[in-house]
Every structure is written in structure tokens, then in C-alpha cells.
């Protein structure tokens, strides 16, 4: 039960995290105009990974995409790449984890397979979260560097008469969304890896051997998964698995490849 809860929670947390990573990647507010010197401005600038925007006091907002690929800073390209890799890995991880969920039965999938898939998705979530955190952190570092550089040449004057105020940018909402989302995806991945340990069948628990009186045959039902011991008309000890629909209780009743008698 605890394993199922851990796995389910890990999946949900990762799902929220990946949704957050996607949201952060699409958001325009990666960097926003620093309003320290001018808290109320009639023209407000903000930038994302894909376009830069200007919001005027009038309410009019104009966004322009970065239509060049080669002209963009290498760091911005790196951040884009990290976020996309994070999203792709996260999406694959989600797909894998859906099939790995203990509460969902897919055909004849065994617990060992589910354990492997859970571990795979967990690792994918961890890497996805790390990619997002790394991407956001690289961008934040770039902002800090540029901020202090632009502060150093804040005013470039012509004879001290005309001032050209350089626009400084600070952390935008997308950075915080990205950090939180990356963290959630990472936590979700760790939870999936923990759940994997509980899912993996431990052979030592199932070394018990069933002894039967000689003469009783062991019948295998074609298409079935497990052996059924034949005790004549005694169906109490006779379980035949045909791979059909089963209740969740039944699923939890048969954790090994052997029958108990």
C-alpha cells in the first residue's frame, strides 16, 4: 500500500513539476525591467526565451519574437536546449510511469517489469528536474552578470547634459516557476525511485516449496501465467489465471510466481 502511495504521489508531483517546466519555458517573464530607480514606469519591458515584450501604460502590449537563431547569445540557446531536454525527458518519463503505476494493469506485465519502468521514469524525472533547474540557474546567472555590468555604465552622458538610461533587467516570474517546477520534478523522480525498491520482487521471500502427494499432476492452462495444482474437484486450492480482468485485491494477493498451498 505504501509503495503504491509513494509511486502515485511521485507521479502526481512529477506531473505538476513537468507542467510547471512547460509553463516556465513558454512564459515571457524570464527577465523583467528593474524598477528600483523608477518604480512607476509608463513603458515596461520583459523578456522570455522566445520573445521580448513591451507593456505600455496605455495597456497596449507588443511582443516581438527572436526570429534569428545565429544572432542569439549562446547562453540563451543553452537555456532553451536545457529546458527542451527537460520537457522531452519529463514527457517520456510520464509516459513510462503511467504504464509502471501499480494501480494500472497492462496485460501480463509483471511486477519486476513495473519496477524497472518505475526506476526508469524516476531517473528521467530526476534528470528532467535537474535540466530545468540548471537552465533557470544559467539564465539567472546571466541576468546577475548583465545587471551589474549595466549598473556600472548606468548613465552614459553627453557633456553631463543628456542622459541615456540603460534598461536593467532582473529576475522574472518564470525563473521562480522554473525553479519550483524543477524541484518538484526532482522530488517526484526520487519518490519514483524509492517506490521502485518496494516494487521489485525479492526472491528470498518466495523460496517456500510446496510438497504434494505423488501422483498429482501439475496442469498448465494454455495462455495462462501460473501453474495450477490439480486436486481433483477441490477448487479451493485451484487457481487458474487466464489473464482476464481481476480486482485490485486479487492483484495484491499474488506477488510471487509461485502458488502457496
Amino acid at each position: 500500500m505504501a509503495v503504491t502511495a509513494c509511486q502515485g504521489l511521485g507521479f502526481v508531483v512529477s506531473l505538476i513539476g513537468i507542467a510547471g517546466i512547460i509553463a516556465a519555458t513558454c512564459m515571457d517573464q524570464w527577465s523583467t525591467q528593474d524598477l528600483y530607480n523608477n518604480p512607476v514606469t509608463a513603458v515596461f519591458n520583459y523578456q522570455g526565451l522566445w520573445r521580448s515584450c513591451v507593456r505600455e501604460s496605455s495597456g497596449f502590449t507588443e511582443c516581438r519574437g527572436y526570429f534569428t537563431l545565429l544572432g542569439l547569445p549562446a547562453m540563451l540557446q543553452a537555456v532553451r536546449a536545457l529546458m527542451i531536454v527537460g520537457i522531452v525527458l519529463g514527457a517520456i518519463g510520464l509516459l513510462v510511469s503511467i504504464f509502471a503505476l501499480k494501480c494500472i494493469r497492462i496485460g501480463s506485465m509483471e511486477d519486476s517489469a513495473k519496477a524497472n519502468m518505475t526506476l526508469t521514469s524516476g531517473i528521467m524525472f530526476i534528470v528532467s528536474g535537474l535540466c530545468a533547474i540548471a537552465g533557470v540557474s544559467v539564465f539567472a546567472n546571466m541576468l546577475v552578470t548583465n545587471f551589474w555590468m549595466s549598473t556600472a555604465n548606468m548613465y552614459t552622458g553627453m557633456g553631463g547634459m543628456v542622459q541615456t538610461v540603460q534598461t536593467r533587467y532582473t529576475f522574472g516570474a518564470a525563473l521562480f516557476v522554473g525553479w519550483v517546477a524543477g524541484g518538484l520534478t526532482l522530488i517526484g523522480g526520487v519518490m519514483m525511485c524509492i517506490a521502485c525498491r518496494g516494487l521489485a520482487p525479492e526472491e528470498t521471500n518466495y523460496k517456500a516449496v510446496s510438497y504434494h502427494a505423488s501422483g498429482h499432476s501439475v496442469a498448465y492452462k494454455p495462455g495462462g501465467f501460473k501453474a495450477s495444482t490439480g486436486f481433483g474437484s477441490n477448487t479451493k486450492n485451484k487457481k487458474i489465471y487466464d489473464g482476464g480482468a481481476r480486482t485490485e485485491d486479487e492483484v495484491q494477493s499474488y506477488p510471487s510466481k509461485h502458488d502457496y498451498v
Epitope: 509608463a42 513603458v43 521580448s52 513591451v54 496605455s58 495597456g59 497596449f60 538610461v165
Partner: antibody, heavy 118, light 113 residues
Amino acid sequence: QVQLVQSGAEVKKPGASVKLSCKASGYTFTSYVINWVKQKTGQGLEWIGEIHPRGGNTYYSEKFRGRATLTADKSISTAYMELSSLRSEDTAVYFCARLRRGNAMDYWDQGTTVTVSS
Amino acid sequence: DIVMTQSPSSLAVSLGEMATINCKSSQSLLNSGNQRNYLTWYQQKPGQPPKLLIYWASTRESGVPDRFSGSGSGTDFTLTISSLQAEDVAVYYCQNSYNYPYTFGQGTKLERK
């Protein structure tokens, strides 16, 4: 068509208050910012402040802060400017204007003359 | 506050001639985010409210005759009337639309010679 219509001329005594109204029609009132501008006879234009009718956010020129109060009533598409502690130098024509892209004022009303005299 | 200085304060031009009005701001009105200059030009005739002519320094408002054009960037701007018409006699104002408080130039009175 877009129209901004102000209240009639006002004559006030020094120290009194005046509340001017600016009724908007022909467009969605909450979609555009309303600005107020002062013009003394034969002189230039002076910006007083602006109000965003949707949220009620206001920005004032430092010169008018504390004396001018901008409000808006969305239900009747009307913006108001109240000017308190009137003095003789407040005698002027007051315009309300709609702000559009480029932070430019595209539609203006005909102006309201406020005379402050003892 | 951004100080807007217009020159000349008055100008007399013959009908059909070109009129040029200059406007200088104490601070750059060029916004790096969209590379637009937040300078607006208005025309005011006696007894009337101002009329919007040009915004973003060079974008003509719809309905404004194409003899009116705006140019300049950063701190220096120009309003040009290519061929003066009788109805163009008015006072012209430039305005900083970039930062609060919005500030206007003192105005240039354009007269017919």
C-alpha cells in the same frame, strides 16, 4: 464614434474643491486609460495624472499629488477628477483624454474651464 | 522629470513651404525593448483640444495628412510639414510618452507668413 464629454464650467472660491466628470462613449470604457491635462489660458499643456478604469490604478504628477484625486465609475463609463484646496493658479481649462498605444492621447474632450476667484 | 524643449517658439512659413519644428528631450525616449521612441506630437488650434498627429516619433495617426511626418531618435526629434496649408496654422506640442510624469514641450506657434 468615440466621445468624451465633460461637465460644465465651474467657478469656485479659494480653498474649495471641484469635481470634474468625463463621460466616455463609443468604446469599452475599461479598456483604455484616462488622462487629465491642465492648460492655463495662452499657455502650454501640463499632465495631471491618469487612471486605469479597469483596476482603478492611478498615477499622478508630483505637483498634483495629494490635491488631485482620480476615480472612475465603470457602471456609467465616467471618470472623475477632484481638485482640492483650490487656489488662483488652478484657474485653467482641464481636459480628459483617452490613452492609446504609444502612450498617446488620441481622443480629447472639449475641456472644462475652472475659475478660482474670491 | 524629463524636460522637453521645443524650438523655435514661433515660426512663420509661407503657404506651400516646408515647416520644421524641433524637440529635444533631457533623457533618451528610445525604449530598448522594442526600439521605439516614445515621443508624441499634437496640434492645437485656438479654442480646441489638442489633436494627436504622430506617436512613436514617426507613426502617423490615422486620418492625419501625409504632409505631416515625424523623425528623430533618442533625444532629438523633428516634426516636418512638407507643404504648409492654411489649416495647419496652430500650436504644436511634443510630449514625452516614455516616463511618468508625461511632460510636454512649451509649444511652437506656427503662423502663416
